[in-house]
Amino acid sequence: QGWQAFKNDATEIIPELGEYPEPPPELENNKTMNRAENGGRPPHHPFETKDVSEYSCRELHFTRYVTDGPCRSAKPVTELVCSGQCGPARLLPNAIGRGKWWRPSGPDFRCIPDRYRAQRVQLLCPGGEAPRARKVRLVASCKCKRLTRFHNQSELKDFGTEAARPQKGRKPRPRARSAKANQAELENAY
């Protein structure tokens, strides 16, 4: 079922910006991106061309059972879990110790779900209940993307704790939770 052929390995995407004969399209000087009709949102700039590339977005294949209350899927489903840290990272001066440390700068980029796939699963319930079919949405690909499109972070509520998972070295930011957040079929983990 579904559209994916799975392998038991992790995908690690580590582009080396210096290798590119051309700048990646979103690093090109496209003035139209900042105009009012585009909502004033700049293009995705994970780092300036002069920055050190700190880019690692991994797609890890993960097998789990779908649960809904006491019911559980007859077979496990396999989806991707997005993992890793995205740029930019810059070496900034430490005014107190006169040393330097790495600190993220610019838009907030995360390794997050980019695409999904739908899959029908059969849920088996205890107590002689008839099996029921449920369509679940599973993570199908991951990308480094910025999370600053939302003005109100509570709009992320349907993804519950998954949306709040912090990157290494970052403090988690509070997100609103909904009652639905614990339902496995809505947990598009990343």
Epitope: E59, P113, R115, R117
Partner: antibody, heavy 120, light 113 residues
Amino acid sequence: EVQLVESGGGLVQPGGSLRLSCAASGFTFSSYSMNWVRQAPGKGLEWVSYISSSGSSIYYADSVKGRFTISRDNAKNSLYLQMNSLRDEDTAVYYCARERYYGDTPFDYWGQGTLVTVSS
Amino acid sequence: DIVMTQTPLSLPVTPGEPASISCRSSQSLLNSVDGSTNLDWYLQKPGQSPQLLIYTLSYRASGVPDRFSGSGSGTDFTLKISRVEAEDVGVYYCMQRIEFPLTFGGGTKVEIK
């Protein structure tokens, strides 16, 4: 300059096989997810298949599942589409298309296409 | 699968006049993790490969003139050309990329009157 060049198209009988190639140049191929999209004569665009940058994630349209196999060789900067059990309805121009490697992921570069004709 | 429906099928236009193409999806194209609407527009000029025009609902691809704009929300989307030029003729396609299988609209053929 980014370039995608498809090859391998041609005339094949129903039930036959064909292997399409897409040669990539001008960018770091191994960092990009790739897709095949086809267009039957006089018709619209139809997405066929996707492969992630490392080849670990693969997806197909229902119409080709079980018959077509997408693969890539990052050392050769090449994308492939192995087409088996070909049908009349597979007749189309086949394009390879590159996705952006971060942020939003539209198809930012397309090849010129290669024509596959399935006919007896 | 997500079904993409484009209207009109054909659009005869007068150079200098505005034009509008509609695209409707059978379900929301919003990625609720980052707030993006995963809808793109492509133009296929006669005898050419498709080219990216607008991505993620409203962002123009590099080199695309600012007479092209994309808008919409939820399941209803619009591509507008503020002043059509002769070079704009071709078939315009919307495409959703929130869910596999990726799907295109049926296309809108823009031609000069």
